[in-house]
């Protein structure tokens, strides 16, 4: 069964995404598995479905259970399961293991701690950050977008970090907290001006109209864990999120790989149902770090159809 674990605290907002993905135009139906009861879509309900998202605003311990999402895709309905557990708030400071998200590691040169699941919520900066339940204060700590940056990391910075933010739904505010462990590793490394491995500068990518196309932007930034390194795509000089074409999406998150000891990142641009107008766009792969920014441009061209039947 295609299932995903999700958890939250009572009286906080919890938003869960259907583990089965589909096009934005596909209808998604949600059910409470134990009773096969349909989850309403009306936002006046405390628990309601909104496309691929299931929203608990706020969550209650009794909401715990398995929820079924059915993506009404063509040909076959695709089924996913969200295993949701809502816990009572702890009176003491300790965050139990079952509430912890994945551990992240950092070093003197790279100390970014991402706030887990925040991309599912409608939140506004700044985030509040706590370490072992104490609010973080001092110039060494910087809340930047959805992550925390710690300057001059020391071994004493290891511990459990909690991010707290407000989710807004139709004018109502709901608190959300998420905790993950941070470990510090001693690392000898260096950073370079970004080197883009793919695509080649001014590359022409052949695509077929009506099919999907993937473009991968891949760059290396030095050795060891890097501080503030990123790769991203732009369309005609505009961020993907601002361009406003739902068929064209960046893959969520950046994959970090170490090839020959080098720290590299890649970002996949997915174009669904390629259209003629996509051939007119300029696709820019951008790689940036503290040294600067490098840009490689790609254009699409129509592929000459070839017979590939067996």
């Amino acid at each position: 069964k295609f299932s995903k674990q999700s958890w939250g605290l009572e009286n906080e907002a919890l938003i869960v995404r259907c583990p089965r993905q589909g096009k934005p135009s596909y209808t998604v139906d949600w059910y409470y598995s134990q009773t096969n009861k349909s989850i309403p879509t009306q936002e006046r309900n405390r628990v309601f479905a909104s496309g691929q998202l299931l929203k608990f605003l706020p969550a209650a311990v009794a909401d715990s259970g398995i929820y079924t999402c059915i993506v009404r895709s063509p040909t076959f309905n695709r089924t996913g399961y969200a295993n949701v557990t809502i816990y009572k708030k702890q009176s003491d400071c300790n965050v139990p293991d079952y509430l912890m998200y994945s551990t992240v590691s950092g070093s003197e040169k790279n100390s970014k701690i991402y706030c887990p699941t925040i991309d599912l919520y409608n939140w506004t900066a700044p985030l509040e950050w706590f370490k072992n339940c104490q609010a973080l204060q001092g110039s060494r700590y910087r809340a930047h977008k959805s992550f925390l940056v710690i300057d001059n990391v020391m071994t004493e910075d290891a511990g459990d970090y909690t991010c707290k933010f407000i989710h807004n739904e139709n004018g109502a505010n709901y608190s959300v907290t998420a905790t993950r462990s941070f470990t510090v590793k001693d690392e000898q490394g260096f950073s370079l001006f970004p080197v883009i491995g793919a695509p080649a500068q001014n590359e022409i990518k052949e695509v077929e109209i009506g099919k999907n196309a993937n473009l991968t932007c891949s760059a290396c930034f030095g050795k060891g864990t890097q501080f503030l390194a990123a790769v991203l795509w732009q369309l005609n000089g505009t961020k993907i999120t601002d361009f406003g074409e739902p068929r064209i999406q960046q893959e969520e998150g950046q994959n970090q790989s170490f090839s020959n000891g080098l720290a590299c990142l890649d970002m996949v641009l997915r174009i669904a149902d390629v259209k003629e107008e996509d051939l007119l766009l300029q696709y820019d792969c951008l790689a940036l770090n503290l040294h600067g920014l490098r840009r490689h441009t790609v254009r699409l061209s129509r592929k000459n159809p070839i017979d590939h039947h067996s």
């Epitope: 295609f2 089965r20 993905q21 589909g22 096009k23 135009s25 596909y26 209808t27 993506v71 009404r72 895709s73 063509p74 040909t75 076959f76 695709r78 089924t79 009506g210 099919k211 999907n212 997915r270 669904a272 149902d273 590939h308 039947h309 067996s310």
Partner: antibody
Framework: EVQLVESGGGLVQPGGSLRLSCAAS????????MYWVRQATGKGLEWVSA???????YYPGSVKGRFTISRENAKNSLYLQMNSLRVGDTAVYYC???????????????WGQGTTVTVSS | DIVMTQSPLSLPVTPGEPASISCRSG???????????LDWYLQKPGQSPQLLIY???NRASGVPDRFSGSGSGTDFTLKISRVEAEDVGVYYC????????FGQGTRLEIK
């Protein structure tokens, strides 16, 4: 070259079992939905089963409970386990490639050469 | 199940002449994503089926441009602008909106 090759067909008695295999090559097998389609001699095409990229399976009523489709991505292989076979299951069985991992659809664009299953006493 | 009905069942054509096959579905094949989930396949004598048209009107890779698909909802047409000898075989329409069902097939033969 993108290719699908079926095997495992043969003669079997009614009530018997048979396991068909389909070896895929030339594409990322794990990223595609896969299908079995059959064709009785002189008849039309009939969809038999499908399996999506996460292993969920789909069947028409005529074979549900008797046939089981499965896949082994590490071996680029698709299987059809056929139990409680009936004379009416006699046909050429084709495996075919369907849409890709993000539900884009562009038909069954690759077909194998087929393997013959004969159910007779 | 969605029933697919093709006509004619047999189609004798003179080479160089156009040909047209109709396919009617028991319910609309138009999905909320804006596409008609209707394919056309050709099975040449002694061969496996091959995809010609997907999503109603999109020609598959390697398919000559004399083949075209049209229609929406419940009525679809496959047209061959100039029939060639190699086009002989059985043509099937197939719906992929709700599971999969094929039409009964149209046999195209050369006069």
């Amino acid at each position: 070259e993108v290719q699908l090759v079926e095997s495992g067909g043969g003669l079997v008695q009614p009530g018997g079992s048979l396991r068909l295999s389909c070896a895929a090559s030339g594409f990322t097998f794990s990223s595609y939905d896969m299908y079995w389609v059959r064709q009785a001699t002189g008849k039309g095409l009939e969809w038999v089963s499908a399996i999506d990229t996460v292993g969920d399976t789909y069947y028409p009523g005529s074979v549900k409970g008797r046939f089981t489709i499965s896949r082994e991505n590490a071996k680029n292989s698709l299987y059809l386990q056929m139990n409680s076979l009936r004379v009416g299951d006699t046909a050429v069985y084709y495996c075919a490639r369907g849409g890709d991992y993000d539900y884009s659809y562009y038909g069954m664009d690759v077909w194998g050469q087929g393997t013959t299953v004969t159910v007779s006493s | 199940d969605i029933v697919m009905t093709q006509s004619p069942l047999s189609l004798p054509v003179t080479p160089g002449e156009p040909a047209s096959i109709s396919c009617r579905s028991g319910q609309s094949l138009l999905h909320s994503d804006g596409y008609n989930y209707l394919d056309w396949y050709l099975q040449k004598p002694g061969q496996s089926p091959q995809l010609l048209i997907y999503l109603g009107s999109n020609r598959a890779s390697g398919v000559p441009d004399r083949f075209s698909g049209s229609g929406s909802g419940t009525d679809f047409t496959l047209k061959i602008s100039r029939v060639e000898a190699e086009d002989v075989g059985v043509y099937y329409c197939m719906q992929a909106l709700q599971t999969i069902t094929f039409g009964q097939g149209t046999r195209l033969e050369i006069k």
